[in-house]
């Protein structure tokens, strides 16, 4: 059997010593074919190793599991159920592997699993029930707090033919089992939108991110029922304005810290709220870097410098008087 | 476990300067406001000033009563505020409390070390 | 400045009986919906404790004897059954404008 490392090290199993074990039943604490184990730190690395399928022999110890740049396409059903369980996981770090399925269930059996990342994979395929295992209506609840998905908005011509936002969604919320979750980043998808219903079914959040992403709007998101949330994560979007209802929503969390950096802010008669709530709250990071995007006469105006008389709307003129 | 543990009050003449320090532990310090809060001997509470957070600068705010007199800072590779008390006087006799902000500062203090007197006597 | 005028001073309460404690600010402390008005419990040689933020949330682990209401510029701290463990003084702060100010406090003891 391939030697396991001591406190300091990794150790790496040799291929032809894995192969020469395949056969038998995996020892406890024989590390995969290429892969990196330390017992010591309860870590197993398979990095960057074009691996096509999560090894079966994993060490029962793993406590922090990297299986990062490979090629896995498919993430099955019990990908990772074993005999005994892995019942020590507790970080599992997919990310960069090249999945484009995450089938239901991919995740069952893992009743330590508090961290996963799926980031930097074309997610074509994220089954309803990837997180929650079953379809049940009320699933048990998941052990995730943290839950890591940003970049994982396929190219265009994979998509199905259905919304991607609603496709994230549905894995979020399916069977309540992520109610517990505390950290959800969904930076860089190209999200548009966010469903009304996502953040009231994941009340324990502390920390979102939304950054880098297409949204317009806040008007039909609601953060009311966040009260836990630290961090909201919104630099990087195409908002425009916030409005008197988010704007009143986003003051009264007793936690909050919002960052709002690079929107094409629209400098009209429509951001007067926005700047006077800008003017005098605290739970703005970074207030005095944002500015003006449009109209052209107000590009790069700090917002915190605007009074009431620099927000005109240009009149609507009658049908009669209009130019085509 | 959030602590805030104050130090470096004493008695001091008037006229004379004092730096008081804060240790705190147990969270993020560069996210959060932290603030002074002063009591003299058997009075209310008095605001003396806050220090925002990375985000929005390390900013500060002052009462009026200390403006030009004392500064706040802090040194965030030590987890520290500090509090630099100059031309001081008999007025500020007090005891020096130190404060976290909650997370949205517009909630105020939620954590507060116990307290470091400061006496200002001929 | 906005100033916090709390009433009574003092107040002397039965075991077992409500404490009801005022607070007028002389303007608003309300910002975008919420009331930035706040209650802490000072006990003798002891720093502030937070009780009640926002006018009516209640700190976690405080006991929920203890309840808060109000908006705008008028406010009131409730106990609904003191406790011997209650005997110490309660200030009003307001967190809606610089400078923060805290009322002058009220002295709750046994009757």
């Known amino acids: 059997s391939s030697p396991t490392s001591s406190a300091s090290s990794f150790s790496s199993s040799a291929p032809f010593l894995a192969s020469a074990v395949s056969a038998q039943p995996p020892l406890p604490d024989q590390c995969p074919a290429l892969c990196e184990c330390s017992e010591a730190a309860r870590t197993v690395k398979c990095v960057n190793r074009n691996l096509t399928e999560v090894p079966t022999d994993l060490p029962a110890y793993v406590r922090n599991l990297f299986l990062t740049g490979n090629q896995l396409a498919v993430l099955p059903a019990g990908a990772f159920a074993r005999r005994p369980p892995l019942a020590e996981l507790a970080a599992l770090n997919l990310s960069g592997s090249r999945l484009d399925e995450v089938r239901a269930g991919a995740f069952e059996h893992l009743p330590s699993l508090r961290q996963l990342d799926l980031s930097h994979n074309p997610l074509a395929d994220l089954s309803p029930f990837a997180f929650s295992g079953s379809n049940a209506s009320v699933s048990a609840p998941s052990p995730l707090v943290e839950l890591i998905l940003n970049h994982i908005v396929p190219p265009e011509d994979e998509r199905q033919n259905r919304s991607f936002e609603g496709m994230v969604v549905a894995a979020l919320l399916a069977g309540r089992a992520l109610q517990g979750l505390r950290r959800l980043e969904l930076a860089s998808n190209h999200f548009l939108y966010l469903p009304r219903d996502v953040l009231a079914q994941l009340p324990s959040l502390r920390h979102l991110d939304l950054s880098n992403n297409s949204l317009v709007s806040l008007t039909y998101v609601s953060f009311r029922n966040l009260t836990h949330l630290e961090s909201l994560h919104l630099e990087d979007n195409a908002l425009k304005v916030l409005h008197n209802g988010t704007l009143a929503e986003l003051q009264g969390l007793p936690h909050i810290r919002v960052f709002l950096d690079n929107n094409p802010w629209v400098c009209d008669c429509h951001m007067a709220d926005m700047v006077t709530w800008l003017k005098e709250t605290e739970v703005v990071q970074g207030k005095d870097r944002l500015t003006c995007a449009y109209p052209e006469k107000m590009r790069n105006r700090v917002l915190l410098e605007l009074n009431s008389a620099d927000l005109d709307c240009d009149p609507i003129l009658p049908p009669s008087l209009q130019t085509s | 476990e959030v602590q805030l543990v104050e130090s470096g009050g004493g008695l001091i003449q008037p006229g004379g300067s004092l730096r008081l320090s804060c240790a705190a532990s147990?969270?993020?310090?560069?996210?959060?406001?932290m603030s002074w809060v002063r009591q003299p001997p058997g009075k209310g509470l008095e605001w003396v000033g806050f220090?925002?957070?990375?985000?929005?600068?390390?900013?500060?705010e002052n009462s009026a009563s200390v403006k030009g007199r004392f500064t706040i800072s802090r040194d965030n590779s030590k987890s520290t505020l500090y509090l630099q008390m100059n031309s001081l006087r008999a007025e500020d006799t007090a005891v020096y409390y130190c404060?976290?902000?909650?997370?949205?500062?517009?909630?105020?203090?939620?954590?507060w070390g116990q307290g470091t007197l400061v006496t200002v006597s001929s | 400045d906005i100033v916090l005028t709390q009433s009574p001073d003092s107040l002397a309460v039965s075991l077992g009986e409500r404490a009801t404690i005022n607070c007028r600010a002389s303007e608003s402390v309300e910002f975008y919906g919420t009331s930035f008005l706040q209650w802490y419990q000072q006990k003798p040689g002891q720093p502030p404790k937070l009780l009640i933020y926002g006018a009516s949330n209640v700190e976690s682990g405080v006991p929920d004897r203890f309840s808060g209401s109000g908006s705008g510029t008028d406010f009131t701290l409730t106990i609904s059954s003191l406790q011997a463990e209650d005997i110490a003084v309660y200030f009003c702060?307001?967190?809606?404008?610089?400078?923060?100010?805290f009322g002058g406090g009220t002295k709750v003891e046994i009757k």
């Open positions: 220090i925002r957070n990375k985000g929005n600068g390390y900013t500060t």
């Open positions: 404060a976290r902000y909650r997370g949205n500062p517009h909630y105020a203090m939620d954590y």
């Open positions: 702060q307001q967190s809606r404008k610089v400078p923060s100010t």
């Open positions: 147990g969270f993020t310090f560069t996210d959060y406001y």
